[in-house]
Interface confidence: low
């Protein structure tokens, strides 16, 4: 589709190699050497078969919603640089990425940037911070299970220790203690009661479960598993899941412009 009458301004895509830990954001910058009047900028990932899968796009001063809301494109104030970010990168986001620009008619042309490689590394265990970060994707080694079991064991040991200390300090108080509310004072949902909210982390990759192909649910374009993690006293963040047919939320864009299609 290249035509000789309109020289193409090159694209850059940087950094050429990017390494982030899982759960962190990974950001590439796609830069146009100059700004054509009318263009579409696409962000692609190379599939194992060397095909380009379109992740998201920028066209005519609007961001085209990606098929996965984790992939975001943002135009920078200078007009020629675009941040292409993966929010909360997963291990399986590792791969080759590039951006591609399409001049719109009458002189339709396509140009691709050089490839860049993203490596998403397994998160190293760190002391917990104030705000919980998205949980790392559970690896085939059942890393999460190991951590969970360890946490439970430590918790049980601490409880036993606490019980022992209480028994030693208050020997009478521990005898015949009732853990339920008294009849004349029912449990109240007042300021003292700590409400339990759910914090939805969205889609997690449960690798140890073999997914069997089955017909998708009528309104969900993809069968995904949702993980809801419970925290005390945190505001709820409901998982929003718009189906393609409801025409709300992220819509599936046409893949016809990947690469070099549409009409836009």
């Amino acid at each position: 589709l290249d035509s000789p009458d309109r020289p193409w301004s090159p694209l850059t895509f940087s950094p050429a190699q990017l390494t982030v830990q899982e759960g962190e954001n990974a950001t590439f910058t796609c830069s146009l050497a100059d700004i054509p009047d009318s263009f579409v900028l696409n962000w692609y990932r190379l599939s194992p078969r060397n095909q380009t899968d379109k992740l998201a796009a920028f066209q005519e001063d609007r961001i085209e919603p990606g098929r996965d809301r984790r992939f975001r494109v943002m135009r920078l104030p200078n007009g020629r640089d675009f941040h292409m970010s993966i929010v909360a990168a997963r291990l399986n986001d590792s791969g080759i990425y590039l951006c591609g620009a399409i001049y719109l008619p009458p002189n339709t042309q396509i140009n691709e940037s050089p490839r860049a490689e993203l490596s998403v590394t397994e998160r190293t265990l760190e002391p917990p911070t104030q705000s919980p970060s998205p949980p790392p994707r559970l690896s085939g080694q059942l890393q999460g299970l190991v951590i969970g079991v360890t946490s439970v064991l430590v918790g049980v040991l601490l409880l036993l220790l606490l019980t022992w200390v209480l028994a030693a300090v208050f020997p009478r108080a521990t005898r015949g203690a009732c853990v339920c509310g008294s009849e004349d004072e029912p449990l109240k949902e007042g300021p003292d009661a700590a409400p339990v909210f759910t914090l939805d982390y969205g889609e997690l990759d449960f690798q140890w479960r073999e997914k069997t192909p089955e017909p998708p649910a009528p309104c969900a374009p993809e069968q995904t598993e949702y993980a809801t993690i419970v925290f005390p006293g945190r505001p709820a963040s409901p998982g929003r899941r718009a189906s393609a047919s409801s025409l709300q939320g992220a819509q599936p864009p046409s893949p016809e412009d990947g690469p070099g299609l549409w009409p836009l």
Partner: antibody, heavy 120, light 111 residues
Amino acid sequence: EVQLVQSGGDLVKPGGSVRLSCVASGYTFTSYYLYWVRQAPGKGLQWIGGVNPSNGGTNFSEKFKSRATLSVDKAKNTAYMQLNSLRAEDTAVYYCTRRDSNYDGGFDYWGQGTLLTVSS
Amino acid sequence: DIVLTQTPPSLSVSPGEPASISCRASKSVSTSGFSYLHWYRQKPGQPPQLLIFLASNLESGVPDRFSGSGSGTDFTLRISRVEADDAGVYYCQHSWELPLTFGQGTKVEIK
């Protein structure tokens, strides 16, 4: 009510040209791409090309690139397809159809079709 | 070009019976949760009618006897209980890349 009303089908001699029209109503004209699909007698569906009414941008099947011209008249909510250098094998019913420009949900409305016969 | 192969080429079904049509693409038309494959029915002398879009989503006004499934290269259109009105030619179509192509069609007749 969404409608795509077609006209322009005719009996044309080989080597001639034809201009088919597709008048759209009942929706915002510039919010949907318009495509042309043809169907030879007793055969399947074949995509010809598409036009973006908001800016006149077009794309084509390689087979029709050199002979087909797609255009729109926004004031009349009308899309046109001109097909040149007609041959007997261009005899077919020609359909215009639309697709939402914001997302790809397939071709949700079709014109009634117009028959083009190429014969000497 | 992506080639869509439909099977069977024709199908004869009794009213009330289920029916299913397969469409196989020469390369994957799916990514990140969306499959760019659509199903149409065409009755004699009429334009095609969209039944299912994006592989599994029922177009408004289409009876829920129709359902679509599949991803990657293999897709299926199912009619849970065929009615006399379902006779016609069924086509799959992809919109993954240019050129857009259709399957060759499956003719469904009612016994």
